[in-house]
């Protein structure tokens, strides 16, 4: 197979014919050294998936349900290119499956038993697979056959295409369960009409259905969406209140050696030459031979799927949960309203050991999952492999953009017993220099910098945000002569000062000696000119408070703070000499797990929090000899957030604005994936 050939998998004679036409037309517009198309014909999409996994083909376009099959072992395929719909300016690559109800009804998602339901059709994504998959474990046993369990769960339904003889309740609201538009309650508009007419109490449809059927906002205001957290939202808040986000149609490839760049190059060229309204002789998004061949006829173009986005992230936790429930038919033994153990995400082996110790002391109420970077941990929480972790504000922002919510805040200044209910204002992000140097905020260019990690608040977002507004470009590695900013590109000058050891050099975890607050300060002590840290870092690591060899003889008076007005002050005066106020670190979780995480952590801190005095012979949650493992060591307690329960409210408008501005300089692959 030529190096630059993309073997496209076709699943019918008509598709194979279109594929050959695609191949020939691409040959005529691409240079001879450019990508080319080869066609492979298989009997079904599942056969195509297997062929790609076996390296007999390279690409195929799939619906969401098949993307799930493609991702499962042993196939291990991943999404590489998405079809988009709508306009180029506002491309839609996903739709949202929603549960619509009338505003004057008073039930929530967990109160659907005994209600009347309207569905688009049996086996369809938004109308059946997703809602029934998510409700699966609430269905009465036996859950097989599924139609019977659903019929016994709702008091009456319209499920077009269901068997009305075997399951009459499923056709109670639409006699015969007609499988075409002859049934007035068929498909999206039909299911909505079923609700609108008062036949049903809830309609399972797409987010766009309401807008397509009710042009008038006043009419739409008579309806609401049911959210998975048992609240309701208005119909235009579907992004924050849906059953699942469903990818429309996606090109998949192998996860390893999958030619994704080549596939993108090919499809990008293809849409330029043969996309919507581009060419008379060949159209990518239509065909004289049939409907939706190779690509959907309704597609307007392609978007490259960000490289960090694997199939789990692409399909989303809710969608995977729903499909897995339906396919595997397994439910937890515990009732769903009971809290299962919370899986904490630990960064590399130091945190994992502390987490294991916590797990033992919690009698298994805490379990541990590991990842090598904070972003990998956030991704694990998103997809359900982990449940929670405590994050610096910069990562609370990324986690929030990825759909996670803050649950509890670390408090550093409030003494018990008021701590748990106090909302602290935050800590100060400061720039620390040696007293012996002549540095000021205005002459940092060309100096050696030490950062906690890329993307963190005090170590990166605040100082680099201020710097950006001064220099108006993102080339921070050119501004400083060298530095250590864990998480930077390995060949960057901002990895040059890092200490490693070798394979972990510049990694954003505790294996890198200059990682985190203590690490950045150590970098200043040993190699750097300026360290960007929290205001407590110097006092916590001087005067013998840190027994490590590099720190045990350090004196607080040998360090000073840089003020934004060009002056310097003692490290005792952060309130009058700081870069900005930073939001405290906070625990984040998925929305569905937030209540359990909060309840469990409040209980755990009562046992292992700052009330424990002897940490040498007892487990202490907020202690790790200045290494800030799992939580900052200066945490007094984890505090309730009250109404600051979204990332925007928690971080505050000013900080969110600052980080959003800095996104032009973002090196976060996860953020790119979550904003796709």
């Amino acid at each position: 197979v030529p190096e630059k050939s993309v073997r496209w998998c076709a699943v019918s004679e008509h598709e194979a014919t279109k594929c050959q036409s695609f191949r020939d037309h691409m040959k005529s517009v691409l240079p001879s050294n450019g990508p080319s198309v080869a066609c492979v014909k298989k009997a079904s999409h599942l056969d195509c998936i297997r062929a790609i996994a076996a390296n007999e083909a390279d690409a195929v376009t799939l619906d969401a349900g098949l993307v799930y099959d493609a991702y499962l072992a042993p196939n291990n395929l991943k999404p590489v290119v998405a079809e988009f719909y709508g306009s180029k300016e506002d491309p839609q690559t996903f739709y949202y499956a929603v549960a619509v109800v009338k505003k004057d009804s008073d039930f929530q998602m967990n109160q659907l038993r005994g209600r009347k339901s309207c569905h688009t059709g049996l086996g369809r994504s938004a109308g059946w697979n997703i809602p029934i998959g998510l409700l699966y474990c609430d269905l009465p046993e036996p859950r097989k056959p599924l139609e019977k369990a659903v019929a016994n769960f709702f008091s009456g339904s319209c499920v077009p295409c269901a068997d009305g003889t075997d399951f009459p309740q499923l056709c109670q609201l639409c006699p015969g369960c007609g499988c075409s538009t002859l049934n007035q309650y068929f498909s999206y508009s039909g299911a909505f009409k079923c609700l609108k007419d008062g036949a049903g109490d809830v309609a399972f449809v797409k987010h766009s259905t309401i807008f397509e059927n009710l042009a008038n906002k006043a009419d739409r205001d008579q309806y609401e969406l049911l959210c998975l957290d048992n609240t309701r939202k208005s119909v235009d808040e579907y992004k924050d209140c849906h059953l699942a986000r469903v990818p429309s149609h996606t090109v998949v490839a192998r996860s390893v050696g999958g030619k994704e760049d080549l596939i993108w190059e090919l499809l990008n060229q293809a849409q330029e030459h043969f996309g919507k309204d581009k060419s008379k002789e060949f159209q990518l998004f239509s065909s004289p031979h049939g409907k939706d061949l190779l690509f959907k006829d309704s597609a307007h173009g392609f978007l490259k799927v960000p490289p960090r986005m694997d199939a789990k992230m692409y399909l989303g936790y809710e969608y995977i949960t729903a499909i897995r429930n339906l396919r595997e038919g397994t439910c937890p033994e515990a009732p769903t309203d009971e809290c299962k153990p919370v899986k904490w995400c630990a960064l590399s082996h130091h945190e994992r050991l502390k987490c294991d110790e916590w797990s033992v002391n919690s009698a298994g109420k805490i379990e541990c999952e590991s990842a090598e970077t904070t972003e990998d941990c956030i991704a694990k929480i998103m997809n359900g492999e982990a449940d929670a972790m405590s994050l610096d504000g910069g990562f609370v922002y990324i986690a929030g953009m990825c759909g996670l919510v803050p649950v509890l805040a670390e408090n550093y200044n409030t003494p018990n017993p008021n701590c748990e209910n106090t909302a602290e204002e935050g800590y100060f992000a400061v720039a620390v220099v040696k007293s012996s140097s002549d540095l000021t905020w205005d002459n940092l260019k060309g100096k050696k910098s030490c950062h906690t990690a890329v993307g963190r608040t005090a170590g990166w977002n605040i100082p680099m945000g201020l710097l950006y507004s001064k220099i108006n470009h993102c080339r921070f590695d050119e501004f400083f002569s060298e530095g250590c900013a864990p998480g930077s590109e390995k060949n960057s000058s901002l990895c040059k000062l890092c200490m490693g050891p070798s394979p972990n050099l510049c990694e954003p975890n505790n294996k890198e000696g200059y990682y985190g607050y203590t690490g950045a300060f150590r970098c200043l002590v040993e190699k750097g000119d300026v360290a960007f840290v929290k205001h407590q870092t110097v006092p916590q690591n001087t005067g013998g408070k840190n027994p490590d060899a590099w720190a045990k003889n350090l004196k607080e008076e040998d360090y000073e703070l840089l003020c934004l007005d060009g002056s310097r002050k003692s490290v005792q005066e952060p309130a009058n000499c700081h870069l900005a106020r930073a939001p405290n670190h906070a625990v984040v979780a998925r929305k569905d797990k937030a209540d359990c995480v909060q309840t469990l952590l409040l209980d755990q801190q009562r046992m292992f929090g700052s009330s424990v005095t002897d940490c040498s012979s007892n487990f202490c949650l907020f202690e790790s000899k200045t290494k800030d493992l799992l939580f900052r060591d200066d945490t007094v307690c984890l505090a309730k957030l009250h109404d600051r329960n979204t990332y925007e409210k928690y971080l505050g408008e000013e900080y969110v604005k600052a980080v959003t501005n800095l996104r032009k300089c973002s090196t976060s692959p996860l953020l790119e994936a979550c904003t796709f």
């Epitope: 050991l353 033992v360 012979s617 007892n618 487990f619 000899k625």
Partner: nanobody
Framework: QVQLVESGGGLVQPGGSLRLSCAAS????????MAWYRQAPGKQRELVAG???????NYRDSVKGRFTISRDNAKNTMYLQMNSLKPEDTAVYYC???????????WGQGTQVTVSS
Amino acid sequence: QVQLVESGGGLVQPGGSLRLSCAASGSIFSIATMAWYRQAPGKQRELVAGITRSGSTNYRDSVKGRFTISRDNAKNTMYLQMNSLKPEDTAVYYCTDYSSRYYHDYWGQGTQVTVSS
């Protein structure tokens, strides 16, 4: 820092039993938490069982009901009684006291357990 030495491993048939010991060179009385880990070839080291100073225990799901962890503070020793052994229990077993957890990635030699017919 307390030095720990593991012993008691060996070759055993599926369904058989072994008792591992972990002897400490100093007093373990004041150590908050002790644990057994294991590492199979090509796999990550994983927590098998742990015991707190007060004697409460915790086990990974796959060994619950088969393994029992205990500690004898007077003898400065921790034990792992392993019954109904399975081939998937084959690994090198290590004990740790967590006391030096934040400074060193220190592990002893471990003791090899092989379950095979």
